[in-house]
């Protein structure tokens, strides 16, 4: 913290300009009016201040706005944003997408910092939901953003926002997250025709139930193996050999390379070996011919 000292004669700052880089910390504290700084924040970024000098400028703004900065100041913080703590940011009320973009730009190319995470949280909570424009912006800066949200947080994503999601945005999502996103995607893309629908829904299929996979198998979609391997095991198990063959189309040959991995391994164990043999891929591990398969879950449901 800088001691309060009188500003030397002739050094009172009349505007925020490069002459201030020659001021010592105590001179900045004494000679720069906080209100002047607040109205000329946009100039700070064009001046190569030291970290120490920026600390003084931040301190002046903190004194001027103890309850949190107004958005007019926040929008022009630029690199001074990196000096803010999550506690500082929690005091803000950021409503403009332009402000959010300006601050995300400052952190561009870096991992999501605690400051950025807090800023996004404040912004989204202020809006009440993750609308399409916000999601567009966030995933542009942080492709993994969507998968960093909890299933509860994802539930506030409206189906209309799903149009902004790119396949790479879902790369790190786990099944619980896809369980939430898939029904939204299904709703968002429901009016598209078969092949277009599959292209859009493909990245979300890790959350699809068995009945939807069965329906897709009737549409000549030719699902690739990478997508198939990301499907929920419990959704794949009830599929018949014929359904999987139709679902994968020419990609069915890839099952051989994946026969030791889930969900293929578990699916093989549920199929009759006779049926697997019809694929001509040499898949082994199915139920031997003549064995009776009891579905115990069905039996329990009946009793």
């Amino acid at each position: 913290e800088v001691e309060k000292t009188a500003c030397p004669s002739g050094k009172k700052a009349r505007e925020i300009d490069e002459s201030l880089i020659f001021y010592k910390k105590w001179e900045l504290e004494a000679c720069v009016d906080a209100a002047l700084l607040a109205t000329q924040m946009d100039r700070v970024n064009a001046i190569p201040f030291t970290y120490e000098q920026l600390d003084v400028l931040k301190h002046k703004l903190d004194e001027l706005y103890p309850q949190g900065y107004p958005e007019s100041v926040i929008q022009h913080l630029g690199y001074l944003f990196l000096k803010m703590s999550p506690e500082d940011i929690r005091k803000w009320n950021v409503t403009s997408l332009e402000t959010l973009k300006a601050l995300l730009e400052v952190n561009k190319g870096h991992e999501m910092s605690p400051q950025v995470a807090t800023l996004i949280d404040r912004f989204v909570k202020g809006r009440g939901q993750l609308d399409k424009d916000t999601l567009d912006t966030l995933t542009a800066f942080y492709p993994g953003y969507l998968c960093s949200l909890s299933p509860e947080e994802l539930s506030s994503v409206p189906p209309s926002s799903i149009w902004a999601v790119r396949p790479q945005d879902l790369d790190t999502c786990d099944p619980r997250q896809l369980d939430v996103l898939y029904p939204k995607a299904r709703l968002a893309f429901q009016n598209m025709n078969g092949s277009e629908y599959f292209v859009k829904i493909q990245s979300f299929l890790g959350g699809a139930p068995t009945e939807d996979l069965k329906a897709l198998s009737q549409q000549n979609v030719s699902m690739d193996l990478a997508t198939f391997m990301k499907l929920r095991t419990d959704a794949v198990l009830p599929l018949t050999v014929a359904e999987v063959q139709k679902l994968l189309g020419p990609h069915v040959e890839g099952l051989k390379a994946e026969e030791r991995h889930r969900p293929v391994r578990d699916w093989i164990l549920r199929q009759r070996q006779d049926d697997l043999d019809t694929l001509g891929l040499g898949l082994q591990g199915g139920i031997p011919n003549g064995y009776l398969v009891l579905d115990l879950s069905m039996q329990e449901a009946l009793s």
Epitope: E18, N45, A46, I47, P48, F49, T50, Y51, L54, Y79
Partner: nanobody
Framework: LQLVESGGGLVQPGGSLRLSCAAS????????IGWFRQAPGKEREGVSY????????NYADSVKGRFTISRDNAKNTVYLQMNSLKPEDTAVYYC??????GGQGTLVTVS
């Protein structure tokens, strides 16, 4: 975004040195550049400033008339020509582009 300072060394009082500030991984054209220095046990202080176009320069009172800042955008480098050096100019010199800090700095010893 990295800045690398060079050109420091040991020089006698009254001697000259030319420091360079080179940009690595980005183009300097768009940035205002400041030279700073920090003597042992003292606060870092501004020495000189040049605007992105090179049209505006500024100096600390203690170096006016002795130091000259310039830039060569084609070489992605900013220079600080230091003449008539004094023992009190001894410090680590850093450059910074709009957003600090610069690199590791370069040591200038006048003795």
């Amino acid at each position: 975004l990295q800045l690398v300072e060079s050109g420091g060394g040991l020089v006698q009082p009254g001697g000259s040195l030319r420091l360079s500030c080179a940009a690595s991984g980005f183009t300097l054209d768009y940035y205002a550049i400041g030279w700073f220095r920090q003597a042992p046990g003292k606060e870092r202080e501004g020495v000189s400033y040049i605007s992105s176009s090179g049209g505006s320069t500024n100096y600390a009172d203690s170096v006016k008339g002795r130091f000259t800042i310039s830039r060569d955008n084609a070489k992605n480098t900013v220079y600080l020509q230091m003449n008539s050096l004094k023992p009190e100019d001894t410090a680590v010199y850093y450059c910074a582009a709009d957003w600090p800090p610069g690199g590791q700095g370069t040591l200038v010893t006048v003795s």
